[in-house]
């Protein structure tokens, strides 16, 4: 840590005749500098030079050839390395005073007549004499104004708004500065600051927007930081809104965006005359083109029980906004003629869900169906298979006779969905076929008789059992059954030689 | 060729309306955004109104917002402004600009002929 | 808005001669800054962007410098067809503003 670097004179502050010449010179144990009241166009007669001495300390020295009310003012020496531009100066201070009888005040420049106020805050009129023995009076419309008075700085108070005169005698001459307007702005010890991007995720060529917004405070500052900022790809705007209330609205622009511009935006707003800081940031994603994504939550074979009510949901990204419709069997679905509808909601900036909603499920709705998302960019689809889940019923139970060989055939035709599976059973004590127990389920591999089955189409089936010799009467049952239900039916088979008594009878 | 062609000036009372085109060739006319700069007789030059490449983005100068409206028509390659109350200081010559984004800074590279117009009684 | 200004309003030269042009931003726009030439009659032509970058098809006498707020325009060897009204503009707030313009005409 070094010490401070030191003055010769070794004074707070010293006055200094009119067009003489005087030098200040500065210590330090690091490079050291100067600053100085004038601007650099008036400090033409401001001489600053580095000087060799034998204690090992660093040396600058600031001369004056003449000295003016100009020069009058804070002079103050500190290392290079310590300045920043956002903390006041480090470092050891001088005050020159150079009296001028025709000059009572240290001019000024322009921007130093406004003097603007924070609400209820002390102020500083900086009217500075040239002499620190000058009495100063502070004027309004009113007449005088109470307020302490320090030459090196001028009048602190609490001024209202409007023009104040500062009056001097020097010698029995009267000097009046030009008016000082003390301007009001409203701030507030919180920043309200917000942020706002009507799109987050934006193509390449288009243009990226986003607003920040600071309420009732019109003593900011707003910085932007933002992928593009160090190439200068981003235009700024500023637009005040004094109705209903005050409100500073920044904006900043991205034409013609890229890959390049993704990433965070961020707005810092700090309050111009305090330690307020306020951050707000959004998340920009920039795609080279549009893009869908289609993320089904139901797989790609799908049943629905008969009169059941389903909902099939499918998630969307995708950007530009897509349009979404669906078809069965390649056919775009025709609402109003079936018990199905579709919608499509927007859940989020680039995120859709479409829902498939079937009523009253029912055969016919059965099929493909597909979900198509598009926009310029891109198309993607997604297709499954819906099968309408129907309980098994027989739709017919026959037998057919082989003639002479006394031979059976019983067939069993089934419908249903899934295909029902048949069951073959036998009863061969016909009086005894009401007990349950009586029946014995009839296995594929008996001699004398077969069984096989035969798929008729999607949702039909036969079955068949055919008996080689049928000697006595028998009762056979099909069972048909699928995971929605089951349904039987009997059929009583008739011995050849006791149909032939009949017959006879 | 890469060139801009403006038309629609003319004359108007104080008051009255007009709208100017201006017809983008040579380029990809969608992928920029475009503006109208104006330079009244003798002074210098005037920014009025941005769009974008896509019409999502309109700015406008103080000085015209609420009359003026820019727009762009991308399948006919056309910019637009339609100018509407207008005042004896909107006398100018109107350019259309194209605005592009080179690497560190963004510039008005092509420009338009101008067309004039004349606000008076 | 950011106000832009220009130094000196005209300049009487001769062919051959160097001849330089000031802008000045009354904030700081980094280096985002173009110069135009406009010849009487005609449109303006961008001649550099980003405060030193020459445009295509722009003849090398031309250069540009500065960054912040203050910035410059040179003319290192006046030709005839350089006759003509300078601006500069900045580019980095809307509204887009440019200098007054500098008058470069013959002495």
């Known amino acids: 840590q070094l010490s401070l670097p030191s003055i010769l004179p070794n004074e707070n502050e010293k006055v200094v005749q009119l067009n003489s010449s005087f030098s200040l010179r500065c210590f330090g144990e690091s490079e050291v500098s100067w600053q100085y009241p004038m601007s650099e166009e008036e400090s033409s007669d401001v001489e600053i030079r580095n000087e060799e001495n034998n204690s090992g300390l660093f040396v600058t020295v600031l001369e004056v050839s003449s000295a003016s009310a100009a020069h009058t003012g804070l002079y103050t020496c500190y290392y290079n390395h310590t300045q920043t531009e956002e903390n006041e100066l480090e470092g050891r201070h001088i005050y020159i005073y150079v009296p001028d009888p025709d000059v009572a005040f240290v001019p000024l420049g322009m921007t130093d007549y406004l003097v603007i106020v924070e609400d209820d805050d002390s102020a500083i009129i900086p009217c500075r004499t040239t002499d620190p023995e000058t009495p100063v009076t502070l004027h309004n419309s009113e007449g005088v104004v109470p307020a302490s008075y320090d030459s090196r700085q001028g009048f602190n108070g609490t001024f209202t708004v409007g023009p104040y005169i500062c009056e001097a005698t020097v010698k029995g001459k009267k000097f009046q500065t030009i008016p000082f307007n003390v301007y009001a702005l409203k701030a507030t010890s919180e920043l309200d600051l917000e942020m706002e991007a009507l799109k987050t995720v934006y193509k390449s060529g288009e243009t990226i927007v986003v607003t920040c917004a600071v309420f009732n405070n019109e003593v900011v500052d707003l910085q932007w930081t933002y992928p593009g900022e160090v190439k200068g790809k981003g235009i700024t705007m500023l637009e005040e809104i004094k109705v209903p209330s005050i409100k500073l609205v920044y904006t900043l622009t991205v034409p013609e965006a890229t890959v390049k511009d993704s990433g965070d935006y961020e707005c810092a707003a700090r309050q111009a005359t305090r330690e307020v800081k306020e951050m707000k940031k959004v998340t920009i994603s920039v795609h080279e083109k549009g893009f869908i994504e289609i993320k089904p939550t139901f797989s790609q074979l799908e049943a629905v029980n008969l009169h059941e009510v389903k909902h099939f949901v499918v998630e969307v990204r995708a950007y530009p906004p897509p349009r979404i419709s669906w078809l069965k069997n390649n056919l775009t679905l025709i609402e109003n003629l079936t018990e199905i509808t579709t919608d499509v909601e927007k859940i989020q900036e680039i995120r859709y869900r479409s829902k498939l909603k079937l009523i009253r499920a029912k055969e016919e709705d059965s099929g493909h169906y597909t979900i198509v998302a598009q926009n310029e960019d891109a198309v993607k689809s997604y297709t499954f298979e819906l099968l309408t889940q129907v309980p098994s019923s027989i739709l017919d139970l026959v037998d057919d006779h082989h003639g002479s060989t006394g031979g059976q055939t019983v067939r069993c035709t089934a419908e249903g969905t899934p295909l029902p599976d048949i069951e073959w059973m036998i009863c061969k004590d016909i009086k005894k076929c009401n007990n349950e127990t009586s029946w014995t389920i009839l296995a594929n591999n008996v001699s004398n008789i077969i069984t096989e089955i035969h798929s008729r189409d999607r949702s039909t089936v036969e079955g068949r059992v055919t008996f080689a010799k049928v000697e006595e009467t028998i009762a056979v049952r099909c069972l048909a059954k699928n995971l929605l239900g089951a349904e039987n039916r009997e059929l009583k088979l008739v011995a050849p030689t006791l149909r032939s008594e009949l017959t006879v009878a | 060729e890469v060139q801009l062609v403006e038309s629609g000036g003319g004359l108007v009372q104080p008051g009255g309306s007009l709208r100017l085109s201006c017809a983008a060739s040579?380029?990809?006319?969608?992928?920029?955004?475009m503006n109208w700069v104006r330079q009244a007789p003798g002074k210098g030059l005037e920014w009025v109104s941005f769009?974008?490449?896509?019409?999502?983005?309109?700015y406008y100068a103080d000085s015209v917002k609420g009359r003026f409206t820019i727009s762009r028509d991308n399948a006919k390659n056309s910019l637009y402004l339609q100018m509407n109350s207008l005042r004896d200081e909107d006398t100018a010559v109107y350019y259309c600009a194209r605005l592009r984004y080179f690497d560190w800074s963004y510039a008005f590279d092509i420009w338009g002929q101008g067309t004039m117009v004349t606000v008076s009684s | 808005d950011i106000q832009m200004t220009q130094s000196p309003s005209s300049v009487s030269t001769s062919v051959g001669d160097r001849v330089t042009i000031t802008c000045r931003a009354s904030?700081?726009?980094?280096?985002?800054l173009a110069w135009y030439q406009q010849r009487p009659g005609k449109a303006p032509k961008l001649l550099i962007y980003?405060?030193?970058s020459l445009q295509n098809g722009v003849p090398s006498r031309f250069s540009g410098s500065g960054s912040g707020t203050d910035f410059t325009l040179t003319i290192s060897s006046l030709q005839p067809e350089d006759f003509a009204t300078y601006f500069c503009?900045?580019?980095?707030?809307?509204?887009?503003?440019f200098g007054p313009g500098t008058k470069v005409d013959i002495n």
């Open positions: 904030q700081g726009i980094r280096s985002w």
């Open positions: 980003a405060a030193s």
């Open positions: 503009q900045q580019a980095t707030s809307f509204p887009f503003t």
């Open positions: 769009i974008s490449g896509s019409s999502s983005t309109m």
């Open positions: 040579g380029f990809t006319f969608s992928s920029y955004s």
